[in-house]
């Protein structure tokens, strides 16, 4: 039975040209996390964090994605095109797969809005394949 929940940084905003931390946390389960996949709204994989093998940042994002902190991901040099949904997919044993969702809004530099995850809220979401 899947008992875990994923807490994410929820809906976040950051300024164009700035950076933002995408963060998920799996709780309420004793399952072993074998891998975390970070994915973009359009089927793109940003990065994979394998528990034993470490980080693989996808070639298209190597220049502006940094691993961490922890199992999270730092997105740098933000553009307006980065606005959209991001997903963390936790592969666990024996539970299976949990998924969390983050919505990032990139704001024009001149406009208001917080930098690096300002004005975000936390939500819980779990999903099993």
């Amino acid at each position: 039975m899947m008992t875990g929940t994923i807490e994410t940084t929820g809906n976040i905003s950051a300024k164009k040209g700035g950076s933002v931390i995408l963060q998920c946390h799996l709780s309420s389960t004793m399952a072993q996390v074998t891998q975390v996949n970070w994915e973009q709204h359009d089927h793109s994989l940003l990065a994979i964090r394998n528990a034993e093998l470490g980080w693989h940042i996808y070639p298209a994002f190597k220049d502006r994605v940094a691993p961490g902190p922890g199992l999270g991901l730092t997105l740098q040099s933000l553009t307006m095109n980065d606005t959209g949904e991001y997903f963390c997919t936790y592969h666990t044993y024996p539970d299976g797969t949990y998924r969390g969702r983050i919505f990032l809004e990139v704001l024009e530099s001149s406009g208001g809005g917080g930098a690096g995850g300002g004005g975000h809220h936390h939500h819980h979401h779990h999903h099993h394949h």
């Epitope: 074998t34 996949n37 394998n50 693989h56």
Partner: antibody, heavy 121, light 107 residues
Framework: DVQLQESGPDLVKPSQSLSLTCTVT?????????WHWIRQFPGNKLDWMGY???????NYNPSLKSRISITRDTSKNQFFLQLNSVTTEDTATFYC??????????????WGQGTSVTVSS | EIVMTQSHKFMSTSVGDRVSITCKAS??????VAWYQQKPGQSPKLLIY???YRYTGVPDRFTGSGSGTDFTFTISSVQAEDLAVYYC?????????FGGGTKLEIK
């Protein structure tokens, strides 16, 4: 340049253990990467078996977990496959390979030439 | 376990032709796919990783595309030395799996 070379018996009897060696030259298996065993059945199907990480930790295909062991001898720069309780279904060509996870994800960039093992009485 | 299906076991082509080999994943694997070439009597060689990126030294006639569940490997102008079996592999999950292979035959 990195080179991997498999060695071991051509023939193993059913219910016995299959033991293979992969000798790596041109790179120390304790310096980085993960070091894998893959088998190819007659008819070409490829099956990932497991690996030993440069740190010494191991990970196995769940379908083999009760029968497989991967170990290493760092002084000889070798890693080993042991598959227990073999049946004729384990007849295959066995490859050792390297995975550079940071650069290529789960793709294997260097392979040995393979060694063929028949399980038969 | 994610199953990778290469529906064509054999494909026949002529030197200079363009040929495409397909691979279908049983679930969404995003772009976590590699392609290998295995020539007769040899071990597999990595050609493509991350669905569309050529490995070092791979000629640019070899390309990969696709995301999600459907992937394609294309040779833009087949050469005689491309006679081989081509395999896809997924690494989206922690249990890596391969397609059954497509044997490219030169007419």
């Amino acid at each position: 340049d990195v080179q991997l070379q498999e060695s071991g018996p051509d023939l193993v009897k059913p219910s016995q253990s299959l033991s293979l060696t992969c000798t790596v030259t041109g790179y120390s298996i304790t310096s980085g990467y993960s070091w894998h065993w893959i088998r190819q059945f007659p008819g070409n199907k490829l099956d990932w078996m497991g690996y030993v990480h440069y740190s010494g930790s191991t990970n196995y295909n769940p379908s083999l977990k009760s029968r497989i062991s991967i170990t290493r001898d760092t002084s000889k720069n070798q890693f080993f496959l042991q598959l227990n309780s073999v049946t004729t279904e384990d007849t295959a060509t066995f490859y050792c390979a390297r995975m550079d996870y940071g650069n290529y994800g789960g793709a294997m960039d260097y392979w040995g030439q393979g060694t063929s093992v028949t399980v038969s009485s | 376990e994610i199953v990778m299906t290469q529906s064509h076991k054999f494909m026949s082509t002529s030197v200079g032709d363009r040929v495409s080999i397909t691979c279908k994943a049983s679930q969404d694997v995003r772009t976590a796919v590699a392609w290998y070439q295995q020539k007769p009597g040899q071990s597999p060689k990595l050609l493509i990783y991350s669905a569309s990126y050529r490995y070092t030294g791979v000629p640019d006639r070899f390309t990969g595309s696709g995301s999600g569940t459907d992937f394609t490997f294309t040779i833009s102008s087949v050469q005689a030395e491309d006679l081989a079996v081509y395999y896809c592999q997924q690494y989206y999950s922690t249990q890596w799996t391969f397609g059954g292979g497509t044997k490219l035959e030169i007419k």
